[in-house]
């Protein structure tokens, strides 16, 4: 029969950051190809990555339709090679993925400090709002649009001349902090979803940005424009 030398996929793993979501699996195919299906608990199965020899499938387009839904995927193994000799009457072997709820499980991408500006003893630090592939009315939503008040940012800041860190938190993408006049500071931010109780509640820290040496300097680290 046609499926006797096909093996079921295994180690199905979701890899998701800022809702960009890839399903990965093993093994690397030998004489077989894969087709992936994805479904919500109540929905129909939809085929993706049809007859692929890859061991990953980008399912972002499907999960962004409703990031609060819970999704299940499965990977089918079909024989490759000469169809006439691999034609089968059996159902192909398949393996189910773990369930995946994007809103709860997507990892937070590394944030970026967009700009900071010092005025006297105050510094305004702005975190860049990352775009996601989640849409509403044909418009792409930012991370803040999707998570709203569930998303906070933590700012770590310290004098360039010392290692003692201070922290600040914001429900927006901006911090206004007090600094000592004449001192230079370094900054790093982290995205956090406090309601999560899992390892993915925090992002990695942003790259460190430091103030220049001249008193009262304001520094722009650059704006990123996203085109979709």
């Amino acid at each position: 029969s046609g499926t006797t030398n096909t093996v079921a996929a295994y180690n199905l793993t979701w890899k998701s950051t800022n809702f960009k979501t890839i399903l990965e699996w093993e093994p690397k195919p030998i004489n077989q190809v894969y087709t992936v299906q994805i479904s919500t608990k109540s929905g129909d199965w939809k085929s993706k990555c049809f007859y692929t020899a890859d061991t990953e499938c980008d399912l972002t387009d499907e999960i962004v339709k409703d990031v609060k839904q819970t999704y299940l995927a499965r990977v089918f193994s079909y024989p490759a090679g000469h169809v006439e000799s691999t034609g089968s009457t059996e159902e192909p072997p398949y393996e189910n993925s773990p369930e995946f709820t994007p809103y709860l499980e997507t990892n937070l991408g590394q944030p970026t400090i967009q700009s900071f500006e010092q005025v006297g003893t105050k510094v305004n630090v702005t975190v860049q709002d990352e775009w996601t592939l989640v849409r509403r009315n044909d418009t792409f939503l930012s991370l803040r649009d999707v998570f709203g008040k569930d998303l906070i940012y933590t700012l770590y800041y310290w004098k360039s001349s010392s290692s003692g860190k201070k922290t600040a938190k914001t429900n927006t993408n901006e911090f206004l902090i007090d600094v000592d006049k004449g001192e230079n500071y370094c900054f790093s931010v982290q995205a956090v979803i406090p309601s999560r109780r899992t390892a993915n509640r925090k992002s990695t820290d942003s790259p460190v940005e430091c103030m220049g040496h001249e008193k009262g300097e304001s520094r722009e680290t650059g704006h990123h424009h996203h085109h979709h």
């Epitope: 190809v33 087709t35 049809f50 090679g81 000469h82 192909p92």
Partner: antibody
Framework: QVQLVESGGGVVQPGRSLRLSCAAS????????MHWVRQAPGKGLEWVAV????????YYADSVEGRFTISRDNSKNTLYLQMNSLRAEDTAVYYC????????????WGQGTLVTVSS | DIVMTQSPDSLAVSLGERATINCKSS????????????LAWYQQKPGQPPKLLIY???TRESGVPDRFSGSGSGTDFTLTISSLQAEDVAVYYC?????????FGGGTKVEIK
């Protein structure tokens, strides 16, 4: 010998539905993936949809996704294409074709059935 | 999606002469693990369905005359009719079966000069 015979074409108004059938004979139908390919009058070939031999997996061109449904009845050796919300641009000859030496290589085609979407 | 571009759109060749049709894919259709090009050529005569000529870019389908040959790799492919016969008047299509959605070239019409 292998035969694929399409039926169900005709003239239909925009927004209406039509179901095409493809009767297969001369080969083990349940062991082959099957496809629908269309050709607008005077134009080139456009792949429409595929269904795996087992009927479990289906895939569609973006232009028909959500409107067309491919299915098969292996007990009747028949392939179907349910076409809903038809548009003028769906006017074409619809061919069924079977997987040949590899998935997506068509060694046999039906003669086609003409679908005309017009008010 | 992989876009297939054929050239020329039409071709007039004298009987017995060589006809050459080109097909270019927007990304490679070569699968490195088996070193095969996932490309096919079809012939379509007026009022008929297409007929498979070549698959894997260069393998002739059973029963296809040996005057038809395919070559190329990666993104650039050629169908050659070494000595055009009257019955070869048709439209020729290339098609990639590397990844879904499957896509065809726009076709090349071959006529007798």
């Amino acid at each position: 010998q292998v035969q694929l015979v399409e039926s169900g074409g005709g003239v239909v108004q925009p927004g209406r539905s039509l179901r095409l059938s493809c009767a297969a004979s001369g080969f083990t139908f349940h062991s082959r993936g099957m496809h629908w390919v269309r050709q607008a009058p005077g134009k080139g070939l456009e792949w429409v949809a595929v269904i795996t031999y087992d009927g479990i997996n289906k895939y569609y061109a973006d232009s028909v996704e959500g409107r067309f449904t491919i299915s098969r009845d292996n007990s009747k050796n028949t392939l179907y294409l349910q076409m809903n919300s038809l548009r003028a641009e769906d006017t074409a000859v619809y061919y069924c074709a079977r997987d040949g030496v590899y998935y997506g290589v068509y060694d046999y085609w039906g003669q086609g059935t003409l679908v005309t979407v017009s008010s | 999606d992989i876009v297939m571009t054929q050239s020329p759109d039409s071709l007039a060749v004298s009987l017995g002469e060589r006809a050459t049709i080109n097909c270019k894919s927007s990304q490679s259709v070569l699968f490195s693990s088996n070193n095969k090009n996932y490309l096919a050529w079809y012939q379509q005569k007026p009022g008929q369905p297409p007929k498979l000529l070549i698959y894997w870019a260069s393998t002739r389908e059973s029963g296809v005359p040996d005057r038809f040959s395919g070559s190329g790799s990666g993104t650039d492919f050629t169908l050659t009719i070494s000595s055009l016969q009257a019955e070869d008047v048709a439209v020729y299509y290339c098609q990639q079966f590397h990844s879904y959605p499957l896509t065809f070239g726009g076709g090349t019409k071959v006529e007798i000069k």
